[in-house]
């Protein structure tokens, strides 16, 4: 069942009369509740993302951020399911994976993550508005879809070469990280209403802004594990449509499994694949805590100005969301 | 100022299928997040599903009752939205509302700062 913290809008105090402290004492215990409230909501991830080396190429990498073990991934382009998506690979963890023109080695990267490589067809570049689906379907969570595009602003000569980064399951990532942040998050929450008994609440001053001026709310990310997800890129070559788009894809029974060998997936087993990288050490809290103070009107020194609605060129990697939440 | 409209709604037989649009005009480069949230007569806002960008990566997350009959997914050319929904049922009749903030928020209606006039679904039995 998937709940929501209820979180009554606050109106942020003047920055000169109460400061950013009276603020922040205030916001947090909401941030840290909602922290605690949300954090179990499986999340699909999708990433398209074009190679500097040849403009007719992009990667495409999918990932489930999730507790439970995935059943089946499908991938398509063109749309979702039911929207005229052409599938491109059914990945299945034991009878192995089945693939269709244009494409030419769908792999399992993690436990919880697979990508892609497309055949070229002959186009020059990739469309912007090329859509790429992957469905997971996992237990107990069930079914879930995510889709994601080229970024319209992709200049390949600007884009980085993508370094290597640990490959974690992610419901591991979710034990290590969401654990360990809930845990201390629940316990300086209790900490903080403990205190807040212990003495007068601070008055806050009705804001003098316009009244449509932003109200402090409660943000969380919805995986505190979404950082240590990222692992080496594949690359795509394709064109704006499928090579195959009126050819019909077998989705009825598991019979054409049958050919696969099982070793076909490619999955990675044990945890030799992921035990040798160390995980990343990332001040969750020291970012929240950053986003708060801009929130109160002092900006932290790495909080840029620009605000996107559509994605940052900078790669997965970049902060996430303009307050440097991840 | 940021301007959100939703269209794709209408009257659609039960096991029918919808897409919804939210288009996104105006001041774009302040939003961050985009959620689909639906309103039931006599029943309050409930949250559908959410997605957020950073970089080359999109993350979308669903409310429980979605169970994969719906999909969350973003033109990023034309700063458009879509709401694909399978499998519909009449308990999914209501109002459907799109919904932007410039902050990572989770599906919490009062954490979005810009809402669309919303456009209405209606699954007959």
């Known amino acids: 069942m998937r709940t929501e913290a209820q979180v009554p809008a606050l109106q942020p105090p003047e920055p000169g009369l109460e400061g950013a402290m009276g603020h922040r004492t205030l916001v947090l215990p909401w941030v840290l509740l909602t922290l605690c409230v949300t954090a179990g909501t499986p999340e699909v991830w999708v990433q398209v993302r074009m190679e500097a080396t040849e403009l007719s190429s992009f990667t495409i990498r999918c990932g489930f951020l999730g507790s439970g073990s995935i059943s089946l991934v499908t991938v398509s382009w063109g749309g979702p399911n039911g929207a005229g998506g052409t599938t491109l690979a059914v990945l299945h963890p034991e009878r192995g994976i089945r693939q269709w023109a244009p494409a030419r080695q769908a792999r399992w990267e993690t436990q919880s993550s697979i990508s892609l490589i497309l055949e070229g067809s002959g186009a020059s570049s990739p469309c912007a508005n090329t859509t790429f689906c992957c469905k997971f379907a996992s237990f107990p969570e069930g079914s879930w879809e995510a889709c994601g595009s080229l970024p319209p602003s992709s200049d390949p000569g600007l884009s980085a070469p993508p370094t290597p980064a640990p490959i974690l399951r992610a419901d591991l990532a979710g034990i290590l990280g969401v654990s360990g942040v809930l845990l201390f998050g629940c316990v300086y929450l209790l900490h903080l209403l403990r205190r807040h008994k212990h003495r007068p609440a601070p008055r806050l001053q009705p804001s003098r802004t316009s009244p449509q001026a932003p109200r402090a709310r409660a943000w969380a990310p919805s995986q505190a594990s979404q950082a240590a997800l990222h692992v080496p890129y594949a690359t795509i070559n394709t064109s704006c449509r499928p090579a195959t788009l009126d050819t019909a894809h077998p989705h009825g029974g598991p019979s054409w499994w049958a050919s696969l060998p099982t070793h076909a997936a490619h999955r990675p087993q044990g945890p030799a694949a992921w035990a040798s990288t160390p995980i990343p050490a990332r001040g969750s809290f020291v970012s929240v805590e950053n986003g708060l103070y801009a929130q109160a009107g002092e900006r932290p020194p790495h909080t840029g100005p620009g605000l996107t609605l559509f994605p940052d060129p900078r790669g997965p990697r970049a902060m996430e969301g303009p307050l440097g939440v991840r | 100022q940021l301007q959100l409209v939703e269209s794709g709604g209408g009257l659609v037989q039960s096991g029918g299928s919808l897409r919804l649009s939210c288009a996104a005009s105006?001041?774009?480069?302040?939003?961050?997040?985009m959620g689909w949230f639906r309103q039931a007569p006599g029943k309050e806002r409930e949250f559908v599903g959410r997605?957020?960008?950073?970089?080359?990566?999109?993350?979308?997350s669903y409310a429980d009752f979605v169970k994969g009959r719906f999909t969350l997914y973003g033109n990023q050319a034309r700063n458009t939205v879509y709401l694909q929904m399978n499998s519909l049922k009449p308990e999914d009749t209501a109002v459907y509302s799109c919904?932007?903030?410039?902050?990572?928020?989770?599906?919490?209606?009062?954490?979005?700062?810009?809402w669309g006039q919303g456009t209405q679904v209606t699954v007959s039995s």
């Open positions: 919904a932007a903030s410039k902050f990572p928020v989770s599906g919490v209606p009062e954490h979005y700062d810009y």
């Open positions: 105006g001041r774009t480069r302040s939003m961050y997040v």
């Open positions: 997605i957020k960008w950073s970089g080359d990566t999109t993350y979308t």
